[in-house]
């Protein structure tokens, strides 16, 4: 059990208060974190708070500054980057969103050996990507979907591809589909790790369906905006790799990377690149029907100037149960062999774990194992790999830092975190330099988050990077809600949850029930991390219960409930969410007429699923931008989870998991629908069928639009948001405003 | 030994067409970007087009865009130049280059075209 | 287009003395772009320098290449009898690819 404490003793009880809804708007308790920009094993960057960009060397103790805020101001530069070699910074500035990852901006080359903008061969504006090569002060960048590659910054640019075109051909950035749901990057070009050759991916979207839909925006006709995205059972990109000599890019031109025959005889995706050196480099491939992935090590044939996988080098990952991996396919982290690698896939029992492949998979050598899941391999040097897991405690919610011994046989296992700061922390990520000389660690939770630097070799904490102390001064007359994570045994399946209280909880009364619900496959909701957000504020102000529920099609509690939802979405997520608020009326604090819920995209499709479930449990619930049928979402994720919508597939299921089959049963309950009008990702189309159906079926519900907002509703319209739905939850419990 | 052999050229009235060809052997074709590259009478070099590996590229001199039409077959270790609308501007010698836009490392003998009524 | 003039048009030598040979851009090149070849009479080109200082394979050190920006320059050390030809610079960095008009290097 976590317990936040509220700290509330009788002498000071006039002294605390309760949070408002007015603090989480307004970002009150918000924490920071500190990640360093590492450009050493023992040096890293870091933005001052006066906006300085400055360089620490970990070792001299020294730090100076290497761009002074002036100059960033003089371009309005909200982000840099150093060239490798030292001698460059970009600047970006006018950043301008497009969808999650995505971006255009400005930007502006500084040369710091002289002090001055470089002038001369100035870079395009906008720019989509832009990046420095690893070694020296290259610069690949993309502008109107096609790359180009700069020797010097001062240099005229050289054209590597000519045919990009707005929502047709994209090079070296990703289309809608890629970005959002395969490579989670706004980039799709990789540098080897020298900088001699840069791979690509070129998506051909010209044979994609076209979602359309207005922005209002402000002129006297709607703008159309206009995304090949390609739904359920659609049309898919045409994905190709190509990789191109950066030092004479002019003589052989970009050289396509083969696919692998047992991929390429029908619909496929590429997954992810790896470089391993700079004449060896790893793409994963995937099959359109996401079970079978294929893992394709490609050497440089300087004979041949061109690019060759032999089918000897070829690792095929297959899953029986399910889909192949977790949310992605895992990518591998290689050895010093350059030709063995660590990468995590489940085991004979269904966990996830991480293997050392050195030949086969069949052959692979599992390093981890257990009832529990290896989550991330962070870095791997000549004498130990760095990973997180959630073995601790058997807390599934919980992230920890291991250390494998690999120079020395038997190989011995550490927990790096376990026992730092074990109230305050136990949910880590890291960050390592070069060589893993020197680590960051940054803890989320469950106490107040704090950044901390560490030795490498031995593992000493050096010192605290970000503490937010302030936060905890802030927090110190904040009356905070109680928080736990417990688990429920039903049938054979494990039930986390997390349930926040109000801080002057009494087992003895009655309290209304909020459920909180993500539920999307391989997601996780039951974490050890410290937020102040609006639930908390419901806890503390409103005195209601919240709870989040990791049900059947979760993550890292092994394949069995992972997989549990395979072709079956909407199914089991909703029975799970039912199933614990039974339990948790039968724990005797919760008023059974005052049970609501309420989700966000996959969680708007689960809670409307289980406000029309017909089980009588719930008054009242929220949908914000929820998935109405799977024939509306995007293909790479729908079918990865559900096949295809077709006769021979799975079209039953996709018709019988609507949320508009079942507009009927929301006849007893007051749910609120909420959507924003320019969501690129879960279309406004999801809402607007499941309105017409509850017309049609003459129900009668309550609807909120956001004029021009994405999936994210973002800025006044968030504040709107959490407004409108806080006197819609608070009417509902019949509380006071 | 790297070989590159032009056939194709010859005398041809304005506004006719003519195909060359370029026979590669020595090397990899498939994995050779390829170009012509012309030569008028006593005059200089001229780049007339260019085409990647697999063909996915393909890029023309403006004064040929829209009449030349430059392909390869890798499985004939073959490149090709449909020369359609000939003018009298076209007559020169044709090379055949390895290489893509520059570097051009290897070159054929060259194969005369005329245009002349 | 990128063009490229070279100068001189026609340089008359000895074996034996050096020559230079100049190339200027009408806009700037990366090195890496600009090429150096030899042509006989008769005879097809022959690549000389890539990367604009970097001898093909085969090519004798007497050729040396060097500049940067838009002025390019191909230096011949000692003029042996085989190399009086007509000399192109070609950059690859922009599309379409352009040559020089050549200079000759003739014999004196």
């Known amino acids: 059990i976590v317990l936040r404490p509220s700290r509330v003793h009788n002498s000071e009880e006039n002294t605390m208060r309760a949070l408002t809804l007015k603090d989480i708007l307004n970002g009150t308790f918000s924490y920071k974190t500190f990640f360093p920009n590492w450009i050493s094993g023992q040096e890293y960057l870091h933005q001052s708070a006066d906006n300085n960009i400055v360089l620490y060397n970990i070792e001299t103790g020294q730090s100076y500054t290497i761009l002074s805020n002036r100059t960033m101001k003089s371009v309005n530069a909200s982000n840099y980057g150093l060239s490798p070699d030292r001698q460059f910074v970009y600047l970006e500035s006018d950043y301008s969103k497009l969808w999650r990852y995505s971006y255009t901006a400005t930007y502006y080359i500084y040369d710091l050996s002289n002090g001055e903008f470089v002038r001369g061969n100035e870079l395009p504006r906008p720019i989509q990507y832009l990046c420095w090569s690893p070694v020296g002060s290259k610069l690949a960048y993309v502008y109107q979907n096609n790359i180009y590659l700069k020797q010097r910054p001062g240099d005229p640019p050289f054209q590597i591809t000519f045919n990009g075109r707005e929502n047709k051909i994209f090079n070296g950035i990703p289309d809608w589909v890629y970005e959002e749901e395969m490579l989670a990057t706004k980039y799709a070009l990789w540098w080897s790790p020298n900088g001699k050759f840069l791979a690509y991916a070129e998506f051909n979207d010209t044979d994609i369906p076209v979602i359309a839909y207005s922005y209002y925006g402000d002129e006297q006709y709607p703008r159309t905006i206009n995304i090949p995205y390609p739904k359920a059972g659609a049309k898919n990109p045409v994905v190709r790799i190509f990789i191109i000599d950066t030092t004479y890019p002019a003589y052989v031109g970009p050289q396509e990377v083969p696919v692998p025959a047992m991929i390429a005889s029908s619909d496929y995706y590429f997954s992810w690149l790896t470089w391993v050196t700079d004449e060896r480099v790893c793409l994963q491939w995937l099959k359109r029907v996401q079970n079978v992935s294929v893992l394709s090590i490609c050497d440089f044939r300087e004979d041949w100037q061109t690019w060759d996988c032999p089918k000897t080098q070829e690792h095929i990952e297959e899953s029986r149960t399910g889909w192949a991996g977790g949310f992605f396919v895992s990518t591998p982290v290689f050895s010093y062999d350059a030709i063995s690698y660590y990468k995590i896939f489940s085991d004979k029992d269904g966990y996830k774990h991480i293997h050392y492949i050195k030949d086969t998979v069949e052959n692979a050598i599992q390093i981890t194992s257990g009832k529990w899941e290896a989550i991330n391999i962070f870095r791997v040097t000549q004498d130990s790999l760095f990973y997180s897991s959630n073995e601790f405690e058997e807390y599934p919610g919980r992230r920890n830092i291991y250390r494998i011994s690999i120079g020395s046989y038997p190989p011995s296992k550490k927990c790096v975190t376990c026992h730092l700061r074990k109230e305050r922390c136990q949910y880590y990520t890291a960050s390592f330099s070069d060589y893993a000389k020197y680590y960051a660690l940054v803890c989320y939770g469950p106490g107040i988050p704090i950044s901390t630097l560490h030795d490498g070799r031995t593992d000493q904490e050096i010192k605290i990077l970000e503490e937010n102390k302030e936060l905890e001064n802030a927090l110190k007359n904040i009356q905070l809600p109680k928080e736990e994570i417990k688990k429920l045994e039903v049938d054979e399946i494990t039930l986390w949850y997390k349930m926040i209280l109000p801080p002057q909880f009494d087992r003895s009364k009655k309290y209304p029930l909020l459920i909180q619900v993500y539920g999307g496959p391989c997601s996780q909701s039951v974490r050890s991390v410290f937020a102040v957000n609006w639930i908390s504020y419901l806890a503390s102000k409103e005195g209601m219960v919240i709870a989040l529920v990791d049900g059947r099609g979760t993550a890292f509690q092994g394949d069995k409930l992972l997989y549990a939802v395979y072709r079956k979405l909407g199914v089991y997520e909703v029975e799970d969410q039912i199933t614990a608020v039974r339990k948790f009326i039968e724990m005797g604090f919760i008023d059974e007429k005052r049970i609501a819920i309420w989700g966000w995209s996959y969680g708007g499709y689960v809670s409307s699923l289980a406000l029309a479930s017909g089980t009588g449990l719930f008054k009242c619930g929220i949908a914000v931008a929820p998935v109405s049928s799977w024939e509306y979402y995007a293909s790479v994720y729908t079918e990865r989870f559900m096949g295809l919508p077709t006769k021979d597939d799975n079209l039953e299921h996709y018709k019988n998991s609507t949320v508009m089959a079942r507009a009927e049963y929301f006849r007893n309950v007051d749910y609120l629908l909420i959507h924003g009008t320019a969501d690129d990702n879960v279309h406004f189309q999801n809402s607007a069928q499941i309105a017409k159906a509850l017309v049609n079926a003459q129900v009668d519900f309550q609807a909120m639009w956001y004029s021009d907002q994405n999936h994210g509703l973002s800025g006044l319209s968030t504040n709107h948001l959490y407004t409108h739905m806080t006197h819609f939850l608070k009417q509902c419990f019949s509380l006071s405003d | 030994e790297v070989q590159l052999l032009e056939s194709g050229g010859g005398l041809v009235q304005p506004g006719g067409s003519l195909r060359l060809s370029c026979a590669a052997s020595?090397?990899?074709?498939?994995?050779?970007?390829m170009s012509w590259v012309r030569q008028a009478p006593g005059k200089g070099l001229e780049w007339v087009s260019a085409i990647s590996t697999n063909g996915n590229y393909t890029y023309y001199a403006d004064s040929v865009k829209g009449r030349f039409t430059i392909s390869r077959d890798n499985s004939k270790n073959t490149l090709y130049l449909q020369m359609n609308s000939l003018r009298a501007e076209d007559t020169a010698v044709y090379y055949c280059?390895?290489?893509?836009?520059?570097?051009?490392?290897?070159w054929g003998q060259g194969t005369l075209v005329t245009v002349s009524s | 287009e990128i063009v490229l003039t070279q100068s001189p048009g026609t340089l008359s030598l000895s074996p034996g003395e050096r020559a230079t040979l100049s190339c200027r851009a009408s806009?700037?090149?990366?090195?890496?772009?600009l090429a150096w070849y030899q042509q006989k009479p008769g005879q097809a080109p022959r690549l000389l320098i890539i990367?604009?200082?970097t001898r093909a394979t085969g090519i004798p050190d007497r050729f040396s290449g060097s500049g940067s920006g838009t002025d390019f320059t191909l230096t011949i050390s000692r003029l042996e009898p085989e190399d009086f030809a007509v000399y192109y610079c070609q950059q690859g960095q922009v599309i379409p690819p352009t040559f020089g008009q050549g200079t000759k290097v003739e014999i004196k």
């Open positions: 990367g604009a200082s």
């Open positions: 280059a390895k290489g893509w836009l520059g570097n051009f490392d290897y």
């Open positions: 806009q700037s090149v990366s090195r890496s772009y």
């Open positions: 020595g090397f990899t074709f498939s994995s050779s970007a």
